[in-house]
């Protein structure tokens, strides 16, 4: 026989059968108590008593950490980067001890004029923020240096920070195969070497959505998944709506267990409702159903 | 930084002699030094230019009257402008490379610091 546990006129009967008053505790949650001092509190899923509630560790909330949230915030950062360890030969400066003395007179002419070069080199690339010369050593002067690029995070970043960096390749490459010493003179504000142009490294912001809601969904790894809002990922489960991935309860209430979700069916005083997705209706005093 | 005041402009009538002197902050000794002008409505051009080793290079316009020199000791480029013309009317001012530039043989160059000017008229 159902066992029905009433809640005033509504109560809540799992899509496979049994009756349960919400708000629930999901027996099917790993349950770990914590006492701290004098104050015993059944702070689940390692949560831990504060002195005034339950400071319950994420996915879970509730007075008793019992209950998994629909939603975990993940973010993003603001803005995501590449450097670029690139090396390229100058032809026009003569190589000095100085140079290496980043206070020296040498150095400081020779940093603001090769930044003001590559400025104009990577003028068009709108993800270029500014070099920074990592080392200068002798050949006639070897400049080893970083081009830092930076773009604003969305789900395509990588892309659009790998094609700056072939564009940056693209530019460095020209610059460097026509600003070229001829008979000993160099009309530009500096010439290469162009055989010197070298692409030692490419280090790109790591940052995956998926993997971040994962981890935070702890063992409900499985059932929480990213879906984009004007480009912003959020971390879901089932249970919060408005997304694709959203499942419909109709006559229900969505709850997450480690099964994954499933809908607790509402039992009002005149119908039952049943069904995975409490779509089933049964009239209490005529026992047809009707969808 | 170094700054460079350019001195010895003025008005000159045509076919007389002028010479333009440029005092430098610092040490020009390796740096490639040149002389620019912008006449009133056009664009700036290089008139002269002298390497760090001393070797000179000039616009044609003004080759055989014009001859660029410098005393690294006084940190100072010159200009001599003889057989002036009334072409030559222009803002002059004097130009350096960075340190230890090489490769200045002309004067598509571009230098780095670069002085205020001083006016050279030449009219009769």
């Known amino acids: 026989p159902l066992a029905t546990i009433p809640v005033s006129t509504t109560s809540l009967t799992s899509s496979e059968g049994s009756t349960i008053s919400t708000p629930s505790v999901d027996i099917s949650t790993p349950v770990t108590t914590s006492i701290v001092g004098d104050q015993c509190s059944r702070c689940k899923n390692g949560g831990f008593w504060d002195g005034l509630k339950c400071q319950c560790l994420t996915p879970y909330y509730g007075e008793s950490c019992e209950e998994v949230v629909n939603s975990i915030d993940i973010a993003p950062p603001e803005t995501v980067s590449a450097q670029m360890e690139l090396t390229v030969t100058v032809t026009s400066v003569k190589f000095t001890d100085e140079l290496k003395n980043h206070s020296s007179q040498e150095f400081r002419e020779f940093n603001k004029t090769f930044t003001e070069q590559m400025n104009i080199v990577y003028s068009g690339i709108p993800e270029y923020v500014g070099v920074n010369i990592t080392n200068l050593r002798l050949g006639s002067v070897v400049v080893e240096h970083d081009v830092l690029l930076r773009t604003k995070y969305t789900p395509e970043y990588k892309t659009a920070l790998d094609n700056a960096t072939e564009v940056v390749k693209q530019k460095i490459t020209k610059v460097t195969t026509e600003q070229i010493m001829t008979n000993d003179n160099c009309s530009a504000l500096m010439c290469f070497n162009t055989t010197g142009t070298q692409v030692q490294n490419i280090t790109v912001t790591q940052y995956d959505p998926v993997e971040e809601c994962r981890q935070k969904a702890e063992e409900y790894e499985d059932y929480f998944l990213v879906e984009y809002r004007d480009q912003k990922p959020y971390c879901i489960s089932p249970c919060e709506s408005g997304f694709n991935a959203s499942k419909n309860c109709n006559h229900g209430k969505c709850q997450m267990s480690q099964n994954g979700a499933r809908c607790l069916c509402v039992t009002t005083e005149t119908h039952w409702y049943s069904g995975e997705d409490c779509n089933q209706g049964t009239q209490k005093s005529h026992h047809h159903h009707h969808h | 930084e170094v700054q460079l005041v350019e001195s010895g402009g003025g008005l000159v009538q045509p076919g007389r002699s002028l010479r333009l002197s440029c005092a430098a902050s610092?040490?020009?000794?390796?740096?490639?030094m040149g002389w620019f002008r912008q006449a009133p409505g056009k664009e700036r051009e290089g008139v002269a230019g002298?390497?760090?080793?001393?070797?000179?290079g000039y616009a044609d316009s003004v080759k055989g009257r014009f001859t660029i020199s410098k005393d690294n000791a006084k940190n100072s480029l010159y200009l001599q402008m003889n057989s002036l013309r009334a072409e030559d009317t222009a803002l002059y001012s004097c130009?350096?490379?960075?340190?230890?530039?090489?490769?200045?043989?002309?004067?598509?160059?571009?230098?780095?610091?670069r002085g205020q000017g001083t006016m050279v008229t030449v009219s009769s």
């Open positions: 610092g040490d020009i000794t390796r740096r490639c």
């Open positions: 002298i390497s760090e080793d001393g070797i000179t």
């Open positions: 130009a350096a490379s960075i340190l230890n530039r090489v490769g200045c043989r002309q004067l598509s160059y571009e230098y780095i610091y």
